[in-house]
């Protein structure tokens, strides 16, 4: 996971989401995405 | 309700190999994404790897790819953890769980079923 410290004094979270394709459609393998997530 | 039961922990030397099985009850198996985890002392739970309901894809954390295999017998019920060439830091409890399809397989709280783990120390 990354972190982000930015001016404001927050730390936004970055992480890493792994799907498996078959359970979004019909292929297989898995799909990576990333989330960005709330402020800490 | 779903019920996950873990076995084949153990004490295993470096470079050794282990089998860890999970059975599930109470709940439609083939509806069910498995995903393995470990936790040591002090630290936090991570992700191990996970497999998909029909068993078709894997995938693994960086930290196990190459050396961990996970594998599911819908005959048994049952998800498989092989691990190979095991290290020192490989030392945890390793915990099966089960989430619903369509989840983030990765992140501790997709899985809203676990065991109760089971120990495997690497030591020599």
């Known amino acids: 996971d990354a972190e982000f410290r930015h001016d404001s004094g927050y730390e936004v979270h970055h992480q890493k989401l792994v799907f498996f394709a078959e359970d979004v459609g019909s292929n297989k393998g898995a799909i990576i995405g990333l989330m960005v997530g709330g402020v800490v | 309700e779903v019920q996950l039961v873990e076995s084949g922990g153990g004490l295993v030397q470096p470079g050794g190999s282990l089998r860890l099985s999970c059975a599930v009850s109470g709940g439609t198996f083939s509806s069910i994404g498995m995903g393995w985890f470990r936790q040591a002392p002090g630290k936090e739970r991570e992700f191990v790897g996970a497999?998909?309901?029909?068993?078709?894809?894997?995938y693994y954390a960086d930290s196990v790819k190459g050396r961990f295999t996970i594998s599911r017998d819908g005959a048994k019920n049952t998800v498989y953890l092989q691990m190979n060439s095991l290290k020192d830091e490989d030392t945890a409890v390793y915990y099966c769980?089960?989430?619903?399809?369509?989840?983030?397989?990765?992140?501790?709280?997709?899985?809203?079923?676990w065991g109760q783990g089971t120990q495997v120390t690497v030591s020599s």
């Open positions: 497999i998909s309901r029909s068993g078709d894809s894997t």
């Open positions: 769980a089960g989430r619903p399809a369509g989840t983030a397989i990765n992140i501790r709280r997709s899985y809203n079923y």
